[in-house]
């Protein structure tokens, strides 16, 4: 690995991450005469190490019988957290992750918080609100995003290697200028992250500096490196 010039930049045109909470002031959707079952499913990308707040459907507390959060994480038994208004009691089944909790006491706030989000929190979260008018659901397909670590180095004569290490989902790599590139390699890790590696060669001696651009849902990054001279090259034209 060369000591060559290496500069990191973070693009100003990053994708904006979803806010930490999808809870909003929504209009009351229940009507006293309604027997319609409202079901909403939301795909929600959340960056690892941030906090996330998941909300139940906007049902008035006076209409509630039971609030249930159902949490389905990969490779684990389904966890349920429930609150019965009549008895003011909460109950948990198969819930072992202490980072997933009620935001406050369920009689005050039915929202669920993940504090902080870990890679193992990928999964499906559903709030079921039982009322005399039927059950109202809101589900979240939570996709945990992991920012890849980006490295760039010159491996041999005018050949550069750019790696986006342990990102989730897999990052995309492009080059300025375009080089003669080997097929992109992907290495999958047990925790769901992916390392992407791109190796390119530049024959033209007028290429001075190459830029590796990494695109990812958590934001874009670029690194650039001035190519070293080919060994044995003493004098060259431009």
């Amino acid at each position: 690995q060369s000591n060559n010039s290496l500069m990191l930049q973070t693009s100003k045109e990053n994708h904006t991450l979803a806010s930490n909470s999808l809870c909003m002031d929504e209009k009351q959707i229940t009507q006293n005469h309604s027997k319609v079952l409202a079901e909403v499913n939301i795909s929600w990308p959340v960056q690892m190490a941030r906090n996330a707040v998941l909300c139940c459907p906007p049902i008035e507390f006076r209409n509630l019988i039971v609030i249930t959060w159902e949490i389905i994480l990969r490779g684990q038994p389904s966890c349920t957290k429930s609150y019965r208004k009549e008895t003011n009691e909460t109950k948990e089944t198969n819930c072992t992750d202490e980072r997933i909790t009620w935001v406050s006491t369920p009689d005050q706030n039915s929202d669920l918080q993940i504090h902080p989000v870990a890679i193992t929190h990928d999964g499906y979260y559903r709030c079921i609100m039982a009322t005399p008018d039927g059950n109202f659901h809101r589900g979240y397909h939570l996709q945990v995003l992991v920012t890849p670590e980006v490295t760039l180095f010159e491996s041999r004569n005018r050949t550069a290697v750019c790696k986006a290490v342990a990102g989730k989902p897999a990052a995309q790599i492009s080059w300025i200028p375009a080089g003669d590139c080997a097929p992109t390699e992907q290495e999958y890790w047990g925790n769901g992250t992916v390392t992407v590696k791109s190796t390119c060669h530049w024959e033209g001696h007028n290429v001075s500096t190459v830029t590796c651009h990494v695109s990812h849902l958590t934001g874009n990054k670029s690194l650039y490196i001035e190519l070293l001279p080919v060994p044995g090259a003493k004098k060259s034209a431009k």
Partner: antibody
Framework: QVQLQQPGSELVRPGASVKLSCKAS????????MHWVKQRPGQGLEWIGN????????NYDEKFKSKAIMTVDISSSTVYMHLSSLTSEDSAVYYC???????WGQGTLVTVSA | DVQMIQSPSSLSASMGDIVTMTCQAS??????LHWFQQKPGKAPKLLIS???NLEDGVPSRFSGSRYGTDFTLTISSLEDEDMATYFC?????????FGGGTKLDIK
């Protein structure tokens, strides 16, 4: 921190030559290209060429091939640029640059005058 | 050689204004570049590296962006001390080439 030291000015006669110096410190001198740039009063910047101290490899813009010669002295971490057959057109500020354009010397003002 | 076309060559603006200038590579060449500020009698100072990365110590009112092969330098709220000449440098191909510069005057 990275520093590039250049003399403030050089006064030379037409037809003569001058050797400009650029002393580097604060980084691994032999691992980074050094570039030279020319700026005439009130005008834009022109790239003259570059040298890689680790191997003495040089590149020159076509326009400066018969004007400039770049050399390096590893022991003093200094890059030199020799400019020959000077005319009034060569009166300018000459900058040395490293780290892919991030660091610049303060520039040497070359005045060609009888 | 890659020509860098910079516009405008000069502009006059008032304090607090939003100011933009652009650099474009000839023939739509895909390049990377830096933005510099130069004041009279001084060496150029790197403001934005690699098209969009704000250098340490540079006020956050400066920003750089890229759209295809067009690069833009924006000053979000002009201050007195911003009166200077600004230019871009493409460092992807040899020879490195500079934009012609934008001379910024305060009205």
């Amino acid at each position: 921190q990275v520093q590039l030291q250049q003399p403030g000015s050089e006064l030379v006669r037409p037809g003569a030559s001058v050797k400009l110096s650029c002393k580097a410190s604060g980084y691994t001198f032999t691992s980074y290209w050094m570039h030279w740039v020319k700026q005439r009063p009130g005008q834009g910047l022109e790239w003259i060429g570059n040298i890689f101290p680790g191997s003495d490899t040089t590149n020159y813009d076509e326009k400066f091939k018969s004007k400039a010669i770049m050399t390096v002295d590893i022991s003093s971490s200094t890059v030199y640029m020799h400019l020959s057959s000077l005319t009034s057109e060569d009166s300018a500020v000459y900058y040395c640059i490293t780290y892919t354009g991030a660091y610049w010397g303060q520039g040497t003002l070359v005045t060609v005058s009888a | 050689d890659v020509q860098m076309i910079q516009s405008p060559s000069s502009l006059s603006a008032s304090m607090g204004d939003i100011v933009t200038m652009t650099c474009q590579a000839s023939q739509g060449t895909n390049i990377n570049l830096h933005w510099f500020q130069q004041k009279p009698g001084k060496a150029p100072k790197l403001l934005i590296s690699g098209g969009s990365n704000l250098e340490d110590g540079v006020p956050s009112r400066f920003s750089g962006s890229r759209y295809g092969t067009d690069f833009t330098l924006t000053i979000s709220s002009l201050e007195d001390e911003d009166m200077a000449t600004y230019f871009c440098l493409q460092f992807t191909y040899l020879p490195w080439t500079f934009g012609g510069g934008t001379k910024l005057d305060i009205k």
